[in-house]
Amino acid sequence: MMTGTIETTGNISAEKGGSIILQCHLSSTTAQVTQVNWEQQDQLLAICNADLGWHISPSFKDRVAPGPGLGLTLQSLTVNDTGEYFCIYHTYPDGTYTGRIFLEVLESSVAEHGARFQIP
């Protein structure tokens, strides 16, 4: 039975040219996290495997950095980065948990971060 829940940064916004940290946190389960996949809509951005470490998709290498923790840092943001991001937690024995984050990249300097996992 899957008892865990994923908390995410929720809906967040950031300025064009800036950077943002995407964070998810799995709680309420003792399942072992074997891997976390990060996806942007239909594109695999990065994978963090408990044994193999991080793999960043080559096409995103210049703008995506691993961490902090199981999170992902997006750099040099463009308006095209606006959209849905998913953290997919592969766990044993529970199975798969998925969290969703919506990022809006703004032209102006009025970007606000979500209530949770705020970035100073």
Partner: antibody, heavy 118, light 107 residues
Framework: EVQLLESGGGLVQPGGSLRLSCAAS????????MSWVRQAPGKGLEWVAA????????YYADSVKGRFTISRDNSKNTLYLQMNSLRAEDTAVYYC???????????WGQGTLVTVSS | DIQMTQSPSSLSASVGDRVTITCRAS??????LNWYQQKPGKAPKLLIY???SLQSGVPSRFSGSGSGTDFTLTISSLQPEDFATYYC?????????FGGGTKVEIK
């Protein structure tokens, strides 16, 4: 250099058993998921089974479920496929392959031929 | 199970030609799509992983694109050593499934 070397293939009668082995070298075997993929003569590729690196949890194609068992011995850097109740349609070249991040199959062995015939 | 449909099943081309092979999944598989090349009597060789990432050591004339359900493998300028059979494979969910293959033959 990553190397995968299958062995254990051969001729077996319908209903018989066979155990395939895949000896791995050149990488930290225990860290990787591994798969068996087969190819019947003149046909395409068919995934058979996979086993995770960290948990040794296993997964099977419906066509072999209940008859085949995938296992691994990380101390010997070896992957196994125990095949029971073999059928003529199991005749194929069997490949073992490394599966980093459970997403792609980056290294394959040379294959071992299993022939099920009376 | 996710079905993978490859087209064409075979094609004839000349050295220097641009060749395109397509693969369609029966449901969305994000970018969990890989391409392999196989020559007679040999094991498959990984060309492209995660839809568009070129495997180390593979010539840059090979490229992959697509996401969701529709994917393409392109060989920009066919070389003599590229005559082989090509397979797509999804790793979105188990069972892993392969396309039926595309045999690239010399015209």
């Amino acid at each position: 250099e990553v190397q995968l070397l299958e062995s254990g293939g051969g001729l077996v009668q319908p209903g018989g058993s066979l155990r395939l082995s895949c000896a791995a070298s050149g990488f930290t075997f225990s860290s990787y998921s591994m798969s068996w993929v087969r190819q019947a003569p003149g046909k395409g590729l068919e995934w058979v089974a996979a086993i995770k690196g960290s948990t040794s949890s296993s997964y099977y194609a419906d066509s072999v479920k209940g008859r085949f068992t995938i296992s691994r011995d990380n101390s010997k850097n070896t992957l196994y496929l125990q095949m029971n109740s073999l059928r003529a349609e199991d005749t194929a070249v069997y490949y073992c392959a490394r599966e980093p991040y459970d997403v792609w199959l980056d290294y394959w062995g040379q294959g071992t031929l299993v022939t099920v015939s009376s | 199970d996710i079905q993978m449909t490859q087209s064409p099943s075979s094609l004839s081309a000349s050295v220097g030609d641009r060749v395109t092979i397509t693969c369609r999944a029966s449901q969305s598989i994000s970018s969990y799509l890989n391409w392999y090349q196989q020559k007679p009597g040999k094991a498959p060789k990984l060309l492209i992983y995660a839809a568009s990432s070129l495997q180390s050591g593979v010539p840059s004339r090979f490229s992959g694109s697509g996401s969701g359900t529709d994917f393409t493998l392109t060989i920009s300028s066919l070389q003599p050593e590229d005559f082989a059979t090509y397979y797509c494979q999804q790793s979105y969910s188990t069972p892993l499934t392969f396309g039926g293959g595309t045999k690239v033959e010399i015209k």
